[in-house]
């Protein structure tokens, strides 16, 4: 039998053992987080699968992910949301130490999908392990991009109190309108629930003593936020290594000076 023709996309294919990985992560997460013990992981996988299986992978909508979003509903306490842009590793290192703060990847749905790729094919029940659409070269409405847009929007919409965002001060655009934070999250913070957005600009160079809070892109972020009546604060984190160390050991004498 001749193999059926398969669409060639520019991006890498579905992560190997994708169904098993999602299911295993779900089981692990619900075991560790008592408030999510009621979640049926088989139903979660079915909803996840239903969002993209048998669908043309360049025509995925946020609506496709709604059953999954409903099953993964979770709330973050006020003042405990940490957004990040182009500095995922440090943000995750931070919440691993500061256990009462949460990034999207510390929530069930973000945890399930973190670093994974997936897509299906139109009119078949198969998962495409060969290639998936690339956001730039193929299409933006692909399963992975739409997933992150959907859950990021929801994460921002449900945030309350003072919301923190970690930004990469080593990049030419510290605040980038094309990032998920710049294109989705910042516009979905709710002024009636969010009093302030506090940006932490993470410096890269050891000798970098510039005030990156004065960067034009940060001023741009403040301008956007201000029109929505959300207060804006910005802090330079000159020494990210020391910053993490001081989160771990706040009573350390060296932590009384600036970081």
């Amino acid at each position: 039998v001749l193999p059926r023709w398969r669409q060639q996309w520019s991006g890498s294919g579905t992560t190997s053992r994708f169904p098993e990985t999602v299911l295993a992560r779900c089981v692990k997460y619900t075991e560790v987080h008592p408030e999510m013990r009621h979640v049926d992981c088989q139903s979660v996988w079915d909803a996840f699968k239903g969002a993209f299986i048998s669908k043309y992978p360049c025509n995925i909508t946020e609506e496709d992910y709604q059953p999954l979003v409903k099953l993964g509903t979770q709330t973050v306490p006020c003042n405990k949301t940490l957004l990040w842009s182009r500095i995922k590793d440090l943000a995750h290192q931070f919440t691993q130490v500061q256990r009462d703060m949460f990034t999207l990847e510390d929530m069930l749905l973000g945890y399930l999908a973190d670093d994974l790729t997936w897509c299906g094919e139109f009119n078949t029940f198969e998962i495409n392990y060969q290639s998936c659409p690339d956001w730039r070269k193929d299409c933006s409405n692909n399963p992975v991009s739409v997933f992150w847009k959907t859950v990021s929007r929801r994460f921002a919409e449900t945030a309350c109190g003072v919301v923190h965002v970690m930004l990469n001060g080593s990049r030419s655009k510290i605040f980038d309108k094309n990032s998920t934070f710049g294109s989705v999250e910042v516009h979905n913070l709710q002024p009636e629930k969010v009093q302030a957005l506090e940006a932490w600009v993470i410096h890269g160079g050891r000798e970098d003593s510039r005030d990156l809070c004065q960067d034009p892109t940060i001023k741009e972020l403040e301008s956007i936020i201000s029109k929505r009546n959300i207060r804006f604060f910005c802090k330079n984190i000159y020494r990210p290594d020391k910053f993490l160390q001081c989160v771990k050991n706040p009573e350390d004498s060296s932590c009384l000076s600036g970081i």
């Epitope: 516009h187 001023k219 741009e220 301008s223 929505r228 009546n229």
Partner: antibody
């Protein structure tokens, strides 16, 4: 003295083009989002367009979308409005105004008059 | 047809208190920055109130307030030099635009 000075207005035929300029002085232009607002004779204020500090975010009123282009040259402290395919209903005094975070449009120019008529 | 609704005119005698209303929606007035501008005859608009606060130089006779999807401008101790057009404005999230009211012409009798 904090000032915005518009120029480039004039009489133009329908379908024609004009380029308005607005030169800023007395404040740090690169710290402000900038706007164009117009006022037709005997009518109220109508926001036309805005451009963010770095030019990354640009917004237009539906009435001018696809015809007008806002831009800025931070090295020259200047804001521009390129107006193409002008219509009679674009006849107005055009003001440039900065946007100060948490305040509003707190500095306005004196305005430049654009008349579209055959 | 303006996105924000204002009465076209208002009037009062010197010393009186006058209030001008501005009605909008949750995508503009309710959650976002609200401004009031004063435009004296033949001049450019001037920022009068931002977020219920006055820029320096604006007399304390002028005050702003907001409740839900409506905002209002109050002028107490009305003076003849207050005769002008007054506009409310707000950022609109759903339109990604600044929206203005149609303006209220204040006459001091």
């Amino acid at each position: 003295e904090v000032q915005l000075l518009e120029s480039g207005g004039g009489l133009v035929q329908p379908g024609g083009s004009l380029r308005l300029s607005c030169v800023a002085s007395g404040f740090t232009f690169t710290n402000y989002e900038m706007n164009w607002v117009r006022q037709a004779p005997g009518k109220g204020l109508e926001w036309v367009s805005s451009i963010s500090i770095t030019g990354n975010y640009i917004y237009y009123a539906d009435s001018v979308k696809g015809r007008f282009t806002i831009s800025r040259d931070n090295s020259k402290n200047t804001l521009y409005l390129q107006m193409n395919d002008l219509r009679a209903e674009d006849t107005a005094v055009y003001y440039c105004a900065n946007y100060k975070s948490y305040h509003g449009m707190d500095v306005w120019g004196q305005g430049t008059t654009v008349t579209v008529s055959s | 047809q303006s996105v924000l609704t204002q009465p076209p005119s208002a009037s009062g005698t010197p010393g009186q208190r006058v209030t001008i209303s501005c009605s909008g929606s949750s995508s503009n007035i309710k959650n976002n920055l609200v401004n009031w501008y004063q435009q004296l005859p033949g001049t450019a608009p001037k920022l009068l109130i931002y977020n219920n606060q006055r820029p320096s130089g604006v007399p304390d006779r002028f005050s702003g307030s907001k409740s839900g999807t409506s905002a209002s401008l109050a002028i107490s101790g009305l003076q003849s030099e207050d005769e002008a057009d007054y506009y409310c404005a707000a950022w609109d999230d759903s339109l990604n635009a600044w929206v203005f009211g149609g303006g209220t012409k204040l006459t001091v009798l």
